[in-house]
């Protein structure tokens, strides 16, 4: 794609530091801790990517439309030959008009028959659809609304029970890791206590007695 934004897509630019002029900037410093992990993509970059995606989508749609036009052209060229009038006399042109009128009449008849078939099919489809709904116990599909969804919830929705297992496992792994670090900390603490105890009189006494 001959577009200038392709290089920008490779290396995200760092967001410029806020200019300390407006009170809103200070409010941001007050409410958000400085150590907070910054978003990987800046707002401007997000916008740039969105624009790029829209551009790609637009090009795709245009390409599809062009393909459809080409397909239509090809279909018409096979059905309708170009008028080759060069050298044909008045007699042939009159005859040709008769031929074309006859062809138009024939095509009209065919179109009428096809339309009748299509109407019949539509009616049949409608009847069958109704029967399906009747068999389902007149089940009415709820209207779908857009909802915000977390990554975990999306995973769960996509993978079902398997996702739940993997999520539980991940939580379990985190838990185990936490317990291990606590245990290590406890052991380190006890060892220090022991050293302190031995270094005092009590320790000397115990040492002497032993």
């Amino acid at each position: 794609m001959a577009d200038g934004s392709s290089d920008a897509a490779r290396e995200p630019r760092p967001a410029p530091a806020p200019i300390r002029r407006r009170s809103s900037n200070y409010r941001a410093y007050a409410t958000e801790p400085h150590a907070k992990k910054k978003s990987k993509i800046s707002a401007s970059r997000k916008l740039q990517l969105k624009t790029l995606l829209l551009q790609i989508a637009k090009q795709e749609l245009e390409r599809e439309a062009e393909e459809r036009r080409g397909e239509k052209g090809r279909a018409l060229s096979t059905r309708c030959q170009p008028l080759e009038l060069a050298g044909l006399g008045f007699a042939e042109l009159q005859d040709l008009c008769r031929q074309l009128h006859a062809r138009v009449d024939k095509v009209d008849e065919e179109r009428y028959d096809i339309e009748a078939k299509v109407t019949k099919n539509i009616t049949e489809i409608a009847d069958l659809t109704q029967k399906i709904f009747d068999l389902r116990g007149k089940f009415k599909r709820p209207t779908l609304r857009r909802v915000r969804i977390s990554a975990d919830a999306m995973m769960q929705a996509l993978l079902g029970a398997r996702a739940k297992e993997s999520l539980d496992l991940r939580a379990h792994l985190k838990q185990v890791k936490k317990e291990d670090t606590e245990k290590e900390n406890r052991e380190v603490g006890d060892w220090r206590k022991n050293i302190d105890a031995l270094s005092g009189m009590e320790g000397r006494k115990k040492k002497f007695e032993s």
């Epitope: 060069a86 050298g87 006399g89 008045f90 007699a91 040709l96």
Partner: antibody
Amino acid sequence: EVKLEESGGGLVKPGGTLKLSCAASGFTFSSYAMSWVRQTPEKRLDWVATISSGGSYIFYPDSVKGRFTISRDNARNTLYLQMNSLRSEDTAMYYCARHHNPDKSGFAYWGQGTLVTVS
Amino acid sequence: DIVMTQSPSSLAMSVGQKVTMSCKSSQSLLNSSNQKNYLAWYQQKPGQSPKLLVYFASTRESGVPKRFKGKGKGTKFTLTISSVQAEDLADYFCQQHYSTPLTFGAGTKLELK
């Protein structure tokens, strides 16, 4: 110089078939409508068939419709006439003719002819 | 079908004489949209193929001598040779190019005295 040369004529039995050819030169063949015209032994001229420049449109008199087929090969600059179910009344000198320019009328150029005898 | 009738079927003329031959159609050959009559005249010399002389009833084909003149409109047409020459010895055919099937007259045979 416009040149039209017919070939393929000969003696054939009634009910037989024959294919005539007409080699064209000296003009842009694919730009002109072409026709076959025959002349009976009594010197009467009969129009046999016409084909448009690209071959999409074809015209015949009732006397040959369903028996004769006109066709052309623009790549080879050749006009054809396939004659099936030949009858004694088809005996004639067969000429291939080039139509005039679009703003004019009539058969501007004729070949020397090829003789077809059905007997 | 349009029937083309030519008269006379033959004529014998001396060199330098004026000749007029006639051609009648069973229906009008006039195209009202362009006011042109779709009639052509052909000359066929012995042992040769036909040659176009006149189209649109009165338009002389390029290379055709001026002594050949076509006239008429609707259903009545004539071909006149103002001063017959020895090389004009031939059969002359009229043809309608107004409607299919394209039809020819039976011809007029020009002979020299």
